[in-house]
């Protein structure tokens, strides 16, 4: 590591946590535009997923997101080979992702549709512990437009525990979004897609480098939260969004003041969904532990608009609709740290329970 870089990393200190979030709750129901992506399956199998925005493509469960609703400048072109053996991928060509990385055709992929009535209440899922996420303005952090998303690279020292002996360190965070009139979250709840979604990617402390953890069960863990519209501006997100104009071009990278990363997440870290899936972009490595929070984070309409129109991607196309279609569960159970299945049903039902090792 070059000298001078170590000087860019400092010890985080404590600060205030976030506010301005909302519960998903039973009011989050499918609309006509966002129909559930899975019907009730026969014999407990997950059927192919078909809906108005993500049409089924062959039998891989991989959808092509070049939709009629996509704006003129969205990334709608298919993945291509550039000079020098350059394998590239795009959100408009997800059918080609397995050619870029075979793992993208795996059985346990992400994102998924979270069907509340099918979640399994798991009492052993404890509130997440975040340590050192409240960063000081110095040292500064790298904010970049990598052509697929906006990414904030995080310094060492942000620690997270999924449970006893399951410790992770945060590597980076990034966002997924749609357009001004089309939502762009990756995960969906009862078929409902949210305006946007934040992912904070973590590496297990059992590994020193990311490449060692790829494909290893529990090697990576992602904290995900839905972004939703509200009248109030979110001051924590403004610290990111106010810099997007500076990185509008693909490949741009700037330094911005450190910020409170925990303020970008919901304040309630106790109510969440948990499942094992994959990276949502190539190489689509599996074994990723996903935690999707029940509480949403609120941004103003102007902020969501800024997110969806500020960045540009490959071939002078707007960086929009950068989400992968939901993937089949293929027998996976989504666990909930709270009785979400009860909340979602108008009448009492048998509450699924989670499994622990040895059951």
């Amino acid at each position: 590591q070059p000298q001078g870089l170590s000087g860019m990393q400092g010890e985080p200190s404590l600060g205030d946590s976030s506010s301005g979030e909302d519960e998903l709750g039973v009011d989050v129901l499918p609309s006509e535009e966002d129909a559930p992506e899975e019907a009730d399956p026969p014999d407990g199998e997950d059927p192919p997923e078909v809906n108005s925005e993500d049409r089924m493509e062959e039998s891989l469960g991989l959808e092509d997101l070049s939709t009629p609703e996509a704006p003129e400048h969205s990334q709608g072109s298919h993945g291509d080979e550039k000079g020098g053996g350059h394998s590239h991928w795009s959100y408009g060509g997800t059918l080609l992702w397995p050619q870029v990385s075979p793992a993208c055709a795996g059985r346990f992929q992400s994102p998924v549709d979270i069907r509340l009535e099918r979640t399994a209440f798991c009492r052993t899922l404890q509130p997440l512990e975040l340590l050192g996420y409240e960063l000081q303005p110095l040292p500064e952090l790298s904010l970049s437009n990598n052509g697929h998303t906006v990414q904030l690279t995080l310094p060492p020292g942000l620690k997270m525990a999924l449970g006893p002996g399951q410790e992770y360190r945060a590597l980076q965070l990034h966002l997924h979004w749609g357009t001004s009139d089309h939502p762009g979250s990756e995960h969906t709840v009862n078929g409902h897609r949210f305006p946007a979604e934040i992912h904070v990617v973590h590496l297990s402390t059992a590994f020193s480098e990311l490449h060692e953890a790829l494909g290893r069960p529990g090697g990576l863990a992602v904290l995900a939260a839905f972004l939703q519209e509200s009248p109030e501006e979110n001051s924590a997100y403004e610290q990111l969004l106010s810099h997007l104009e500076e990185i509008s071009e693909e490949g741009s990278k700037i330094e911005i003041p450190g910020l409170d990363v925990s303020a970008l997440l919901p304040s309630d870290l106790s109510r969440y969904y948990r499942y094992e899936g994959s990276l949502t972009t190539p190489p689509c490595s599996q074994g990723v532990i996903w935690t999707v929070f029940n509480e949403t984070v609120k941004l103003s309409a102007k902020q969501l608009h800024t997110l969806s129109v500020s960045l540009w991607g490959p071939r002078d196309s707007r960086l929009q609709l950068n989400f992968r279609a939901t993937q089949p569960l293929n027998g996976r159970t989504i666990e909930a740290s709270f009785p979400a299945a009860e909340d979602s049903s108008p009448e009492p039902v048998h509450v699924n329970s989670c499994f622990t090792a040895g059951d």
Epitope: T153, L210, H211, L214, G251, P283, G313
Partner: nanobody
């Protein structure tokens, strides 16, 4: 062990050219195609400066001080990053570092470029 190994540095006269290479080995080969790659440099007594970036899609960005003189490129089949440096100036003297940005930063050990008559 992940390794990014730079080569091609050396002593060159003002106005001359050099081509730097950065080869990925070990685990770095697995993530090379998906990483945004970059060249940074550090002049004596100065901080780290971002010189050029190339994304996984091939998009490029350059610092204003090298725009029009330097060209960044990559060959994913060879897992190699390049920096073609033309019209070199004394102020380009620095240690040049290769960087791979894929969820975390991977760094090479650096190669010295000295521009002097």
């Amino acid at each position: 062990q992940v390794q990014l190994v730079e080569s091609g540095g050396g002593l060159v006269q003002p106005g001359g050219s050099l081509r730097l290479s950065c080869s990925a080995s070990g685990g770095a080969r697995n993530i090379f195609s998906f990483a945004a790659m970059a060249w940074y440099r550090q002049a004596p007594g100065k901080g780290l400066e971002l010189v050029a970036v190339i994304t996984s899609a091939g998009g490029t960005q350059y610092s204003s001080s090298v725009k029009g003189r330097f060209t960044i490129s990559r060959d994913n089949s060879k897992k190699t990053l390049y920096l073609q440096m033309n019209s070199l100036r004394a102020e380009d003297t620095a240690v040049y570092y290769c960087n791979a940005d894929y969820y975390q930063d991977y760094w090479g050990q650096g190669t010295q470029v000295t521009v002097s008559s």
